[in-house]
């Protein structure tokens, strides 16, 4: 056959679907690779062809669209499973072509099993809720297009293994789950099960997401430098190791980049001709507030190094702060015998 633009295996789209549930999978060509949509392609006389490679096989084979009850079908640029089976797992290819044009892409589809408590190998999306912030909602994801708006599905929400009736502060409201005030105890996996009828059959869609309760923007503050501070003086003799920790607290801020850096005499450590190493560690609180520690280390400090200015800087979306460390050269203690002699001489 003639040459075809092959976009290869699109591993960015690792599609996972539950066994024995409907799945609708759009051909990724129109979403990520081509600059036109399916309608335009269809109008231009292009045909969309589907085929697949079973798991642990190399052989590409056509998809059987003649299964009982139309279990697998194609509608426009969507491949439908009503429902999936475990052995539908494999790499699926959609190819758009006519006599002069050809473009194709493959993507992996994994059909996964779940237990009675909705545990599975499925990668779960994470939804962040602000702690004690206001009424916040999560919505049952990826259910659009499965049934027409005239069909009224039943939706049941679960936390972990248990059906949510209104416990504590959480109210099921159809496709939404409302958190009146989010508390840390709301952390966990939430599952919506959508049940709808189609052609005399009943289908279930199971969608699980992880809720993580994070710091509220109303409590967010600019970075706080705990160290260096005015109470600690770094007093060293030449030849000793100088270790200065810079410890900074960052409030959780959605999509904020938290940064900590040192300057020595106003320059980045890399731009100073001394042997400096900086080690960073990061820890998080339960609400994802962050504490970053950067330890500046000079193995064998010189008297010149002890005269330099060491400043710790921190920046987040809330602002920028800086704090200088107090570094001094240790004054050698006067020798005891000399001190005594002077003392006696004075009497």
């Amino acid at each position: 056959s003639e040459r075809c633009d092959d976009w290869g295996l699109d591993t960015m789209r690792q599609i996972q679907v539950f066994e024995d549930e409907p799945a609708r999978i759009k051909c990724p060509l129109f979403e990520h690779f081509l600059k036109f949509n399916y309608s335009t392609a269809h109008s231009a006389g292009l045909t969309l062809i589907w085929y697949w490679t079973r798991q642990d096989r190399d052989l590409e084979e056509p998809i059987n669209f003649r299964l009982p009850e139309n279990r697998i079908s194609k509608e426009k640029d969507v491949l439908w499973f009503r429902p999936t089976l475990l052995n539908d797992t494999g790499n699926y290819t959609c190819m758009l072509r006519n006599t002069t044009y050809c473009s194709k892409v493959a993507f992996p589809l994994e059909v996964v099993q779940k237990d009675s408590c909705f545990n599975s190998p499925m990668k779960l999306p994470v939804h962040k809720l602000y702690i004690e912030y206001g009424i916040q909602r999560i919505t049952c994801p990826n259910v659009d297009g499965y049934f027409p708006s005239s069909v009224k599905p039943t939706i049941t929400w679960y936390m972990g293994c248990y059906k949510i009736q209104n416990f504590n502060n959480v109210i099921p409201e159809g496709m939404n789950l409302s958190f009146l005030i989010a508390f840390i105890s709301n952390n966990g996996n939430y599952t919506c099960v959508v049940t709808y009828p189609e052609n005399g059959r009943t289908f279930h869609l199971t969608r699980t997401l992880t809720v993580k309760v994070v710091g509220s923007p109303k409590n967010a503050v600019p970075p706080v430098i705990h160290s260096p501070n005015d109470h600690v003086v770094y007093e060293k003799e030449p030849g000793e190791e100088l270790l200065i920790p810079c410890t900074v607290y960052f409030s959780f801020l959605m999509d904020s980049r938290n940064e900590v850096w040192w300057t020595i005499d106003g320059k980045k450590p890399d731009d100073i001709p001394i042997d400096v190493t900086i080690n960073e560690s990061i820890s998080h609180s339960r609400t994802e507030d962050e504490t970053r520690t950067q330890i500046l280390s000079i193995k064998k400090v010189t008297s010149e190094d002890l005269k330099r200015s060491y400043v710790c800087h921190a920046r987040s979306a809330k602002g920028e702060v800086a704090k200088a460390a107090t570094v001094k050269q240790k004054v050698p203690a006067p020798r005891y015998t000399v001190e005594l002699a002077c003392g006696f001489g004075a009497t």
């Epitope: 972990g160 209104n166 416990f167 504590n168 840390i184 105890s185």
Partner: antibody, heavy 119, light 112 residues
Framework: EVQLVDSGGGLVKPGGSLRLSCAAT????????MSWVRQGSGKGLEWVGR??????????DYAAPVKGRFTISRDDPKNTLYLQMNSLKTEDTAVYYC??????????WGQGTLVTVSS | DIVMTQSPLSLPVTPGEPASISCRSG???????????LAWYLQKPGQSPQLLIY???NRASGVPDRFSGSGSGTDFTLKISRVEAEDVGVFYC?????????FGQGTRLEIK
Amino acid sequence: EVQLVDSGGGLVKPGGSLRLSCAATGFTFSNVWMSWVRQGSGKGLEWVGRIKSKTDGGTIDYAAPVKGRFTISRDDPKNTLYLQMNSLKTEDTAVYYCTTGELLGFDYWGQGTLVTVSS
Amino acid sequence: DIVMTQSPLSLPVTPGEPASISCRSGQSLLHNNGFNCLAWYLQKPGQSPQLLIYLGSNRASGVPDRFSGSGSGTDFTLKISRVEAEDVGVFYCMQTLQTPITFGQGTRLEIK
């Protein structure tokens, strides 16, 4: 199915002690705030106290009449809520219920256990 | 403490007729987040109380739609559109805005 089973009630002399238990099933007990509510014979409902989930700080609040005498605790691995009652008075005589929730009201209740304080 | 006051304390009703109970709080029960921290309960003879209404106006699951709650701030009402014999018992309102959580004195509904 959510179930709360209250136990531990009985007859006790004034100044005595008693420990009530509430065994919970059908929900993730460790996530839920739990309260005790009591009801004297022919009287209305009276809130006794509440314990938050440990993840929410485990804070315990008490009604003024029982503060310093009653202690609420929870054993999450055992899915059990407790009410330790010391220095009991005749006015503590009531049916004691354990309940779940708070903000949305108490949505599930135990069957109640009768505590009688009498000499 | 927030004082909850119910009226009437006794309510004789003919089956099929509507009934209404009022509950007043000593201070506003409107939470900063915009909802009212008020619940209604029915305690049938010899049973534990059951939740009817939460957040002032939301019917709890399994509660017949003849029960409805309304009001905001300090004034709340529980309405029964058509009383049935099985509704006999004591109705309580309760505030959950702050501890100590407090209940109304109760309204006894009886069939005429």
